[in-house]
């Protein structure tokens, strides 16, 4: 069964910078990755970035840089502008659309006790299968 893992990491050098790492564990060809915050995509979450394997990446503020790390993992850098975007208390979700498996999504957040530079454990928490 395919799984999605999510890690949220606070940058040690810049406490206002966060990076979300997501990966897809399973067979199949990834056709699209969607990163959202505040909940799953289409279920109360706000889209932060869309990564297409061929067409590139499109992101929305406060996302700063989305990129493919490998053929099955991505990263998204975010810049916390202050009280208006309290990333430390936010849930980030990654949805991987793959063929022929369908869509798989998991969410994660920065652990409350996190020190800068530490990340959430890469425990896959499948939220839903969209199809």
């Amino acid at each position: 069964t395919p799984e999605v893992w999510v890690q949220v990491q606070m940058e040690a050098t810049e406490l206002s910078s966060f990076t979300v790492h997501c990966g897809f564990l399973g067979p199949g060809s990834i056709s699209l990755v969607t990163v959202s915050w505040g909940g799953p995509d289409g279920a109360g979450g706000t889209k932060l970035a869309v990564l297409h394997p061929e067409l590139g990446t499109r992101q929305w503020a406060p996302a700063r840089q989305a990129r493919w790390e490998t053929q099955s993992s991505i990263s998204l850098a975010l810049e916390d502008s202050g009280a208006s975007s309290p990333f430390a208390n936010t849930t980030f979700c990654c949805k991987f659309a793959s063929f022929p498996e369908g869509s798989w999504e998991s969410c994660g957040s920065l652990p409350p006790s996190s020190d800068p530079g530490l990340s959430a454990p890469p425990t896959p928490v499948p939220i839903l299968r969209a199809d």
Partner: antibody, heavy 120, light 113 residues
Framework: QVQLQQPGAELVKPGTSVKLSCKAA????????MHWVKQRPGQGLEWIGE????????NYNEKFKNKATLTVDHSSSTAYMQLSSLTSEDSAVYYC?????????????WGQGTSVTVSS | DIVMTQSPSSLAMSVGQKVTMSCKSS????????????LAWYQQKPGQSPKLLVY???TRDSGVPDRFIGSGSGTDFTLTISSVQAEDLADYFC?????????FGGGTKLEIK
């Protein structure tokens, strides 16, 4: 063949707003994002933002998010960009551009541009 | 934002000569999924709107003469015109189409002697 039609010029007063149009023809209007690009005389190109005509979703360059507002009218296959609180810094040629899904941010088709002059 | 830097700012060449112009990005434009470089080149002739020449660093757009050759990877890119023609008089801009916001270089002005 893809065509993006823009008015040639607009003369506007400082402090006012202007709404620029871009009429699309020759392709399915809702099939690709519409981009807007600024070019000051003798200078380079700056991406202002983009709009998805199928759902109205927008994405702005942070530099222009309080300056430009992008909208579309499906009935006329026209994209609009409103520029507010105009100053001399806004005097420029503004292009609309669409893509053919070669990549998200390749701008394959360009309008002829609208020259905006801000002067009292 | 990714910063794009072009050089030289201008150059003058004779018809038939080989022209090369450079574009550097402040970070890699290499897509980790498919190893493609997300860089485009545009040509803007006097009084006209820009025209897409090359995307993915080396893929010519349809109808673009094969004398226009894009190359490079990572952060360093080059546009070469193998044998410049009088109609190539124009400004040339590179642009990263890697991510939002897409950003352009300052341009290289090509003059014909």
């Amino acid at each position: 063949q893809v065509q993006l039609q823009q008015p040639g010029a607009e003369l506007v007063k400082p402090g006012t707003s202007v709404k620029l149009s871009c009429k699309a023809a020759g392709y399915i209007f809702t099939s690709s994002w519409m981009h807007w690009v600024k070019q000051r005389p003798g200078q380079g190109l700056e991406w202002i933002g983009e709009i998805n005509p199928s759902d109205g979703r927008t994405n702005y360059n942070e530099k222009f998010k309080n300056k430009a507002t992008l909208t579309v009218d499906h009935s006329s296959s026209t994209a609009y960009m409103q520029l507010s609180s105009l100053t001399s810094e806004d005097s420029a040629v503004y292009y609309c551009a669409s893509n053919a899904d070669r990549a998200y941010y390749t701008m394959d088709y360009w309008g002829q541009g609208t020259s905006v002059t801000v002067s009292s | 934002d990714i910063v794009m830097t072009q050089s030289p700012s201008s150059l003058a060449m004779s018809v038939g000569q080989k022209v090369t112009m450079s574009c550097k990005s402040s970070q890699s434009l290499l897509n980790g999924f498919n190893q493609r470089n997300f860089l485009a080149w545009y040509q803007q002739k006097p009084g006209q709107s820009p025209k897409l020449l090359v995307y993915f660093a080396s893929t010519r757009d349809s109808g673009v003469p094969d004398r226009f050759i894009g190359s490079g990877s990572g952060t360093d890119f080059t546009l070469t015109i193998s044998s410049v023609q009088a109609e190539d008089l124009a400004d040339y801009f590179c642009q990263q189409h890697y991510s939002t916001p897409p950003t352009f270089g300052g341009g290289t002005k090509l003059e014909i002697k």
